[in-house]
Interface confidence: low
């Protein structure tokens, strides 16, 4: 198992082997087999199943062994501890990052990693990409950062900073993790956003015309969602008028937090006859189908 910390900060690690809290735990420097003392006056000392670096130094990096002595079995665990120098810039390298959290709810909480190992007191300070969070949307409570009305702009690296108290001395601890926003999908009956219901569009005889129909289907990738055109309740391809074509392919977009598709009907040269036709835009998915009828009139 691996643990890491920053130079001049407190680091507390737990023995990777688990045993009853009553069983004694001994810690050793793995390479020298030298026992680590329990006296608190030492900078590195043992407290039950925990090894404390108060504060940590780069030279403390190495492999530590813990032995849990139970009546019928000794269990040994090994811990690879790496103490890093504080990064000079705000870009926190991957090796100093705790697990990424993914949020899909409008309100979300981020937990400060490893805080439970420490004797800490509120408040915990939170930073995003090294800037202190002061907006009222961000609230620190216990070991959590609550974010209200989460958006993609809230993605980034969040650092919590708190104080560990030991023997009347306070030590700083910081921990960083990434937060990414995962859109929560929802599906719904299609909504045609354009053109409006029973819309009449002005065109010029002899000139080309394009009618775009856009429909939205919820959020996420929508199974077999489609936008189609019909002329006088007949599919464009069967209508038998080469001047009128439905554009190939899907034009995908996002609007008001919803996924939408657009299909364009193109008339190469509008004729008088076209003014008497009904043009239906159909939006369909597994919830059902909706139809908006469009008519043309001379400009």
């Amino acid at each position: 198992k691996s643990s890491w910390g920053l130079e001049n900060e407190a680091l507390i690690v737990r023995c990777p082997q688990r045993g009853r809290s009553t069983y004694p735990v001994e810690w050793y420097y793995s390479d020298t087999n030298e026992s680590i003392p329990t006296q608190k006056r030492n900078r590195i000392f043992v407290s039950r199943d925990r090894l404390k670096f108060l504060p940590a130094r780069v030279e403390d990096s190495g492999i530590y062994a813990c032995v849990i002595r139970s009546p019928n079995l000794n269990k040994t665990g090994y811990l690879n501890v790496t103490i890093h120098k504080k990064p000079p810039s705000c870009n926190i390298p991957d090796y100093l990052m705790y697990s990424t959290v993914r949020g899909s709810d409008k309100n979300f909480k981020i937990t400060c990693p490893t805080i439970d190992l420490y004797n800490w007191t509120a408040p915990v300070q939170w930073f995003k990409n090294c800037k202190a969070l002061q907006e009222p949307r961000f609230r620190a409570h216990r070991s959590y950062l609550f974010i209200d009305n989460v958006t993609h702009d809230d993605e980034g690296d969040y650092t919590c900073q708190f104080t560990h108290a030991e023997n009347g001395t306070n030590y700083i601890v910081t921990a960083t993790r990434s937060f990414t926003v995962e859109e929560k999908g929802f599906s719904m009956f299609p909504v045609i956003t354009n053109p409006p219901y029973n819309h009449t569009m002005e065109v010029e005889i002899g000139k080309p015309a394009s009618i775009a129909c856009s429909a939205c289907f919820g959020k996420g990738s929508h199974f077999l969602a489609d936008v189609l055109w019909q002329i006088n309740k007949t599919v464009v391809g069967n209508f038998g008028e080469a001047r009128i074509q439905e554009e190939e392919g899907r034009n995908e977009s996002s609007s008001n937090d919803m996924d939408c598709l657009t299909s364009v009907l193109r008339i190469t040269g509008v004729t008088e006859k076209d003014l008497s036709l009904e043009y239906d835009c159909l939006a369909l998915n597994l919830h059902g189908m909706i139809r908006h009828t469009i008519r043309l009139r001379r400009k």
């Epitope: 999908g185 929802f186 599906s187 919820g218 929508h222 199974f223 489609d226 189609l228 995908e252």
Partner: antibody, heavy 116, light 107 residues
Framework: EVQLVQSGAEVKKPGESLKISCKGS????????IGWVRQMPGKGLEWMGI????????RYSPSFQGQVTISADKSISTAYLQWSSLKASDTAMYYC?????????WGQGTLVTVSS | EIVLTQSPATLSLSPGERATLSCRAS??????LAWYQQKPGQAPRLLIY???NRATGIPARFSGSGSGTDFTLTISSLEPEDFAVYYC?????????FGQGTKVEIK
């Protein structure tokens, strides 16, 4: 890489219950439809029903309504197909499918054999 | 429900030949129609959606046409890996339905 991994083959007796699974990975599970398709031995494909894990909207084909239950547990990105009382005629290969726009991903199939 | 009828049931052709598969719907499905390929022991694979749009990664020798009630899948020049069963599927009305399949076999 998007993957749908289905649970292993099952051999059951008539009247027994069964729940088979389909675990999605490599994509946002709550944002895509998952459908179940039956293929009886030597026969064609039949849509059984579909679920949208984002809001648990479920729709069944009339022939399968009341015969099976489709559900999903988004916390473990898994969709399920279950029977409360199997019949010999339920013997088939069952596929789960995730289809969105131009992409399609299918599970490897779960063979269910019901025999006394 | 909308019934899809595929023809022929079996098509015996040689590699390099042109394959034309037909799918007829019992009522108009506009162009909300997809084609799938299935090889023995494998899951189906989407070839064409919206009647004529090739899915990602599908070779140009596969093309779809038609709208309303009559649809065609054409394989311009059969490759050895194209011998399989082909299904059409409509998604215009619920329930979604498949045709019974056309088997393309080596002559």
């Amino acid at each position: 890489e998007v993957q749908l991994v289905q649970s292993g083959a099952e051999v059951k007796k008539p009247g027994e219950s069964l729940k088979i699974s389909c675990k999605g990975s490599g994509y946002s599970f709550t944002s895509y439809w998952i459908g179940w398709v039956r293929q009886m031995p030597g026969k064609g494909l039949e849509w059984m029903g579909i679920i949208y894990p984002g809001d648990s909207y479920t729709r069944y084909s009339p022939s399968f309504q009341g015969q099976v239950t489709i559900s999903a547990d988004k916390s473990i990105s898994t969709a399920y197909l279950q029977w409360s009382s199997l019949k010999a005629s339920d013997t088939a290969m069952y596929y789960c499918a995730r289809i969105g726009g131009m992409f399609d991903y299918w599970g490897q199939g779960t063979l269910v054999t019901v025999s006394s | 429900e909308i019934v899809l009828t595929q023809s022929p049931a079996t098509l015996s052709l040689s590699p390099g030949e042109r394959a034309t598969l037909s799918c007829r719907a019992s009522q108009s499905v506009a162009n909300a129609l997809a084609w799938y390929q299935q090889k023995p022991g494998q899951a189906p694979r989407l070839l064409i959606y919206k009647a004529s749009n090739r899915a990602t990664g599908i070779p140009a020798r596969f093309s779809g046409s038609g709208s309303g009630t009559d649809f065609t899948l054409t394989i311009s020049s059969l490759e050895p890996e194209d011998f399989a069963v082909y299904y059409c599927q409509q998604y215009y009305g619920w329930p979604i339905t498949f045709g019974q399949g056309t088997k393309v076999e080596i002559k």
